[in-house]
C-alpha cells in the first residue's frame, strides 16, 4: 500500500519545507485515494472482463451510488462553494458503506482497500473542518447501511464482482469531480 500523505520520503528529506495548507492537504489526500482506487481497479479488471463489458452485461443499475449533479454547485457553471462542499462531504459519507463492502473483496490488494477506506475517513474529517454549514450535512442511517451491506454481500459472485467494479468507477468519478471543485475554492 502506498504511504499516506505527509509520510513519504520527500517529507522526511525536506524538514524546512512550509507545512501544507488545509487546501493542499485535502488535494494531496484525494490524489492519494485516487492512486489507491487505480490499484484496486487494476486487480478487478485483471480478474475478469467486467471493466469492458459492464455496459452490455447490465440492463439496469440501482446501486444508487453518489453522483455529482448540476444542482450540487460543484461544476463551473453555477458553482456554489458552500452547496458543493456539503455535497462532497455528504457523498463521501454515503460512499463509506460501499467502501466497507470492498473490504475482503480483494486478494492481493487487501491492504490497499483498507488504505482507501481509512484515507477517506481522514478526508471527511479534513473537509468537515473546512465546512461552515455542518448542519446541512446528513449522515446516513447506520441501520439502513447495515441492511444494505447484508444485501450486497448476499449477491452471487458475478454480481459482487460487477458491484465492486461499479463502486470503484463511481468513487473515482466522484473524487475527480470533487478535486476539480475544491481547487476552485
Amino acid at each position: 500500500a502506498p504511504v499516506p500523505p505527509g509520510e513519504d520520503s520527500k517529507d522526511v528529506a525536506a524538514p524546512h519545507r512550509q507545512p501544507l495548507t488545509s487546501s493542499e492537504r485535502i488535494d494531496k489526500q484525494i490524489r492519494y485515494i485516487l492512486d489507491g482506487i487505480s490499484a484496486l481497479r487494476k486487480e478487478t479488471c485483471n480478474k475478469s472482463n467486467m471493466c469492458e463489458s459492464s455496459k452490455e452485461a447490465l440492463a439496469e443499475n440501482n446501486l444508487n451510488l453518489p453522483k455529482m449533479a448540476e444542482k450540487d454547485g460543484c461544476f463551473q457553471s453555477g458553482f456554489n462553494e458552500e452547496t458543493c462542499l456539503v455535497k462532497i462531504i455528504t457523498g463521501l459519507l454515503e460512499f463509506e458503506v460501499y467502501l466497507e463492502y470492498l473490504q475482503n473483496r480483494f486478494e492481493s490488494s487487501e491492504e490497499q482497500a483498507r488504505a482507501v477506506q481509512m484515507s477517506t475517513k481522514v478526508l471527511i474529517q479534513f473537509l468537515q473542518k473546512k465546512a461552515k454549514n455542518l448542519d446541512a450535512i446528513t449522515t446516513p442511517d447506520p441501520t439502513t447501511n447495515a441492511s444494505l451491506l447484508t444485501k450486497l454481500q448476499a449477491q452471487n459472485q458475478w454480481l459482487q464482482d460487477m458491484t465492486t467494479h461499479l463502486i470503484l468507477r463511481s468513487f473515482k468519478e466522484f473524487l475527480q469531480s470533487s478535486l476539480r471543485a475544491l481547487r476552485q475554492m
Epitope: A59, L63, K151, A154, Q155, N156, M162, T163, L166
Partner: nanobody, 125 residues
C-alpha cells in the same frame, strides 16, 4: 431457494404468437429480477429479455425487440413472455431465470441464481 417452472411452449407457424409463463415458488418473488434466456440446438444459451423487480421496465435482445414483451405479476409469482411475429430462428428451449441481486439487472447468465428446466418453442411451417 426458488423453484421455477416454465410453460406455454409448443409448435407454431412463422408469424404466429405464443405466451410463455414462469411460475416461481417462494414468498420473496417481488425482490427477484426475472429473465428469459434461450438455447437453440447446437448453439450457446443467449439472453432474450429481463424485467426489474417492480415490473416497471423490460429489456430485450436486439433480435427480439419489438416482437417480444416481458411482464410480471408479483401477486401471482409469475413472469410472462409474450412472443409475436415468431420466426424459425426463434426455435429454441426457453429458460426462465431469477436473480437475487437486489440492485443490478443482468443481461448475462452469470448474474442469475436460479433456473427453470425450460420449455420448447418450435417455429415451423
Amino acid at each position: 431457494e426458488v423453484q421455477l417452472v416454465e410453460s406455454g411452449g409448443g409448435v407454431v407457424q412463422p408469424g404466429g404468437s405464443l405466451r410463455l409463463s414462469c411460475a416461481a415458488s417462494g414468498r420473496t418473488f417481488s425482490s427477484y429480477v426475472m429473465g428469459w434466456f434461450r438455447q437453440a440446438p447446437g448453439k450457446e444459451r443467449e439472453f432474450v429479455s429481463t424485467i426489474n423487480w417492480a415490473g416497471s421496465r423490460g429489456y430485450y435482445a436486439d433480435s427480439v425487440k419489438g416482437r417480444f414483451t416481458i411482464s410480471r405479476d408479483n401477486a401471482k409469482n409469475t413472469v410472462y413472455l409474450q412472443m409475436n411475429s415468431l420466426r424459425p430462428e426463434d426455435t429454441a428451449l426457453y429458460y426462465c431465470a431469477a436473480s437475487a441481486g437486489g440492485f443490478l439487472v443482468p443481461r448475462v447468465g452469470q448474474g442469475y441464481d436460479y433456473w427453470g428446466q425450460g420449455t420448447l418453442v418450435t417455429v415451423s411451417s
